[in-house]
Interface confidence: medium
C-alpha cells in the first residue's frame, strides 16, 4: 500500500485504460496506472484522475490508507430541469433554499418550521396560507368549530443550538437525508453515497459507505432454475471475508448479494442497512469503514450503464437505513 517498498509494476507495458480514463503515474512515482474515477476507492498507489479535478479523500486521520475519489469542484446537480454546479445555492421555490453538493441537492426551509403550543389566549393554533404570502402563518381559531380567523400570531420558536449537546433543538432545520445512491460498482467493492443535513448546525454533509452488490467472481447465471429468468437473492454457501485494497475484514460475514437475470433486467439492492466493518491491513493497521449490507434485492428494467456513478445518483436509489448518530453522553 505505501511507497516504502521497491517499485514493482504489475506489467511491463502500460495498461490500456477505458475511454475517458487517464493513464497516470502512481502516487509513488513507480508505475503507470489507470486513474481511479469519481466514487472509486483510491490509495497512495492508486491515485484519482487529476485531469477531472479528483482527489483522494481519506476521511478521518485513522483511515489514511484508503480513500474515495472525490471531485474538488464536485459533480453538478440536475434539479427541476436545471443544472447547478456543486456548491451553488438556488431557491427552488419561495419556501426552500437549496444547495447542490457533489451531485445531490439538499434544501433548508425559508419559512419558519416553528411550533405553536395551545395557550389560554390561543387555545386552537392553526397554520394557514394567507393570500399574497408564501409562508403559512399561525392563526388562532375560536373553539366550538367557529372558523373566524384572528390575526397571525408570533409562534413559539425553537431554541438555537450553540454547543455539542446533540439533543438540543435545531432552529428552522428541515432535516433531510437523501437515499443512498446505488453502488458505484455492479460487482466487487464499490462506494455508495448520500447527503444529509442531520447534524448540529443543519449543514449539508456527504456520507459514504462501502458496498458490494455481488462478488465479481460468482457465476450466478448457472444457479437460475429452468423456466426462470432471474435469481433475485442467491444463497451464499459460506461466510465470506471482505477484501479492500489488500486489507481483509477481521470478521467473516454471511452477507446477502443480489442475483442476475437472463432477460435484460438487472437486480439491485432494495432494502439495505449500514454497519461498521473492521479491516486488518498487512502492516497490522486496523481500519473501520461503514459498509452496506443487503436485506432485499429487486429486479427491474431500469438499468443504467455499468459502474456509472453519475447515472446512479439520478436513477437508482436505495431504500435503507437512516443515519445513526452516536454521542458520548
Amino acid at each position: 500500500q505505501d511507497c516504502s517498498a521497491q517499485c514493482q509494476c504489475a506489467a511491463e507495458a502500460a495498461p490500456h485504460c477505458p475511454a475517458g480514463v487517464s493513464l497516470v503515474l502512481d502516487g509513488c512515482g513507480c508505475c503507470r496506472v489507470c486513474a481511479k474515477q469519481l466514487g472509486e476507492l483510491c490509495t497512495e498507489r492508486d491515485p484519482c484522475d487529476p485531469h477531472k479535478g479528483l482527489f483522494c479523500d481519506f476521511g478521518s486521520p485513522a483511515n489514511r490508507k484508503i480513500g474515495v475519489c472525490t471531485a474538488k469542484d464536485g459533480a453538478p446537480c440536475v434539479f427541476g430541469g436545471s443544472v447547478y454546479r456543486s456548491g451553488e445555492s438556488f431557491q427552488s421555490s419561495c419556501k426552500y433554499q437549496c444547495t447542490c453538493l457533489d451531485g445531490a441537492v439538499g434544501c433548508v426551509p425559508l419559512c419558519s418550521m416553528d411550533v405553536r403550543l395551545p395557550s389560554p389566549d390561543c387555545p386552537f393554533p392553526r397554520r394557514v396560507k394567507l393570500p399574497g404570502k408564501c409562508c403559512e402563518e399561525w392563526v388562532c381559531d375560536e373553539p366550538k368549530d367557529r372558523t373566524a380567523v384572528g390575526p397571525a400570531l408570533a409562534a413559539y420558536r425553537l431554541e438555537d443550538t450553540f454547543g455539542p449537546d446533540p439533543t438540543m433543538m435545531r432552529a428552522n432545520c428541515l432535516v433531510q437525508t437523501t437515499e443512498w445512491s446505488a453502488c458505484s460498482k455492479t460487482c466487487g467493492m464499490g462506494i455508495s453515497t448520500r447527503v444529509t443535513n442531520d447534524n448540529t448546525f443543519c449543514r449539508l454533509e456527504k456520507q459514504s459507505r462501502l458496498c458490494m452488490v455481488r462478488p465479481c467472481e460468482a457465476d450466478l447465471e448457472e444457479n437460475i432454475k429452468k423456466g426462470k429468468k432471474c435469481i433475485r437473492t442467491p444463497k451464499i454457501a459460506k461466510p465470506v471475508k471482505f477484501e479492500l485494497s489488500g486489507c481483509t475484514s477481521v470478521k467473516t460475514y454471511r452477507a446477502k448479494f443480489c442475483g442476475v437475470c437472463t432477460d435484460g433486467r438487472c437486480c439491485t439492492p432494495h432494502r439495505t442497512t449500514t454497519l461498521p466493518v473492521e479491516f486488518k491491513c498487512p502492516d497490522g493497521e486496523i481500519m473501520k469503514k461503514n459498509m452496506m449490507f443487503i436485506k432485499t434485492c429487486a429486479c427491474h428494467y431500469n438499468c443504467p450503464g455499468d459502474n456509472d456513478i453519475f447515472e446512479s445518483l439520478y436513477y437508482r436509489k436505495m431504500y435503507g437505513d437512516m443515519a445513526h448518530h452516536h454521542h458520548h453522553h
Epitope: E159, D160, T161, F162, G163, P164, D165, T167, M168, M169, T200, F201, H328, H329
Partner: antibody, heavy 114, light 110 residues
Framework: EVTLKESGPVLVKPTETLTLTCTVS????????VHWIRQPPGKGLEWLGV???????DYNAAFMSRLTISKDTSKSQVVFTMTNMDPVDTATYYC????????WGQGTTVTVSS | ETVVTQEPSFSVSPGGTVTLTCRSS?????????ANWVQQTPGQAFRGLIG???NRAPGVPDRFSGSILGNKAALTITGAQADDESDYYC?????????FGGGTKLTVLG
C-alpha cells in the same frame, strides 16, 4: 425572562462537601442543559461540568472523582456537589445555561477555610 | 493538559474594529470545538455572546460576530462602544469537556 440563581453555603471547612443549588426560571431543564463554572479571586474561568437536557453529564477530568451534578426538572433545580473541599477551591461558583453560555447566575462566593 | 490561549489585553478606539482570538494547544480550532465567547462586564456580570463558533446569543447586537480565522476561533467587534470595555473569555469543547481561555481585557480608548 430567563434567570439562574445559585444558592448554598458561603463558608465550607476543608474536607467537607460543598452542595450548591441552581434554580432556573424562564426555561425548562428538559430543553436546556446547565453548566457549572468557577472563578477563583482575581483569576479566569474554570469549567467544572454540565448536566445536559436529557440528564447525561460531563465533567472536567480534574474534578471527576469529586463532582456530581444532578437535577430535578419538576423543581427547575440543578444540584452541584463537590466533595473533599480544599482552600484552593475558594472561588465564585456560577451556573450558566447551555446554548452558548448565554445566561448566567449572579454567582455565589464560597470560601474554604478552617 | 489542553490549554486555550487568548491575548491578555487589547485596546480599540471608539467606533473601531477589534478581533480577539482563541488558540488551542492541540491543533487547529474547528467547528467541532463549538467556540463560545463570554463577556464579563466590570460589574462582574457574565453574558454569552457567541456559541457554536458563530451563532449570536439572544439579544446580542450584530456588532459581535464569531468565526474561525486560520487555526483560531475569533470574536470580532465592529463599531466598538465604551460599554464594550470588559473581559472576554472563549471556551472550546473537546469531545467531553470545555476548556476556558485565560481571557482578554478589552480597553476602549478615550
Amino acid at each position: 425572562e430567563v434567570t439562574l440563581k445559585e444558592s448554598g453555603p458561603v463558608l465550607v471547612k476543608p474536607t467537607e462537601t460543598l452542595t450548591l443549588t441552581c434554580t432556573v426560571s424562564g426555561f425548562s431543564l428538559s430543553t436546556f442543559g446547565v453548566h457549572w463554572i468557577r472563578q477563583p479571586p482575581g483569576k479566569g474561568l474554570e469549567w467544572l461540568g454540565v448536566i445536559w437536557r436529557r440528564g447525561g453529564t460531563d465533567y472536567n477530568a480534574a474534578f471527576m472523582s469529586r463532582l456530581t451534578i444532578s437535577k430535578d426538572t419538576s423543581k427547575s433545580q440543578v444540584v452541584f456537589t463537590m466533595t473533599n473541599m480544599d482552600p484552593v477551591d475558594t472561588a465564585t461558583y456560577y451556573c450558566a445555561r447551555d446554548g452558548g453560555f448565554d445566561y448566567w447566575g449572579q454567582g455565589t462566593t464560597v470560601t474554604v477555610s478552617s | 493538559e489542553t490549554v486555550v490561549t487568548q491575548e491578555p489585553s487589547f485596546s480599540v478606539s471608539p467606533g473601531g474594529t477589534v478581533t480577539l482570538t482563541c488558540r488551542s494547544s492541540i491543533g487547529a480550532v474547528t467547528t467541532s470545538n463549538y467556540a463560545n465567547w463570554v463577556q464579563q462586564t466590570p460589574g462582574q456580570a457574565f453574558r454569552g455572546l457567541i456559541g457554536g463558533t458563530s451563532n449570536r446569543a439572544p439579544g446580542v447586537p450584530d456588532r459581535f460576530s464569531g468565526s474561525i480565522l486560520g487555526n483560531k476561533a475569533a470574536l470580532t467587534i465592529t463599531g466598538a462602544q465604551a460599554d464594550d470595555e470588559s473581559d472576554y473569555y472563549c471556551a472550546l469543547w473537546y469531545s467531553t469537556h470545555y476548556v476556558f481561555g485565560g481571557g482578554t481585557k478589552l480597553t476602549v480608548l478615550g
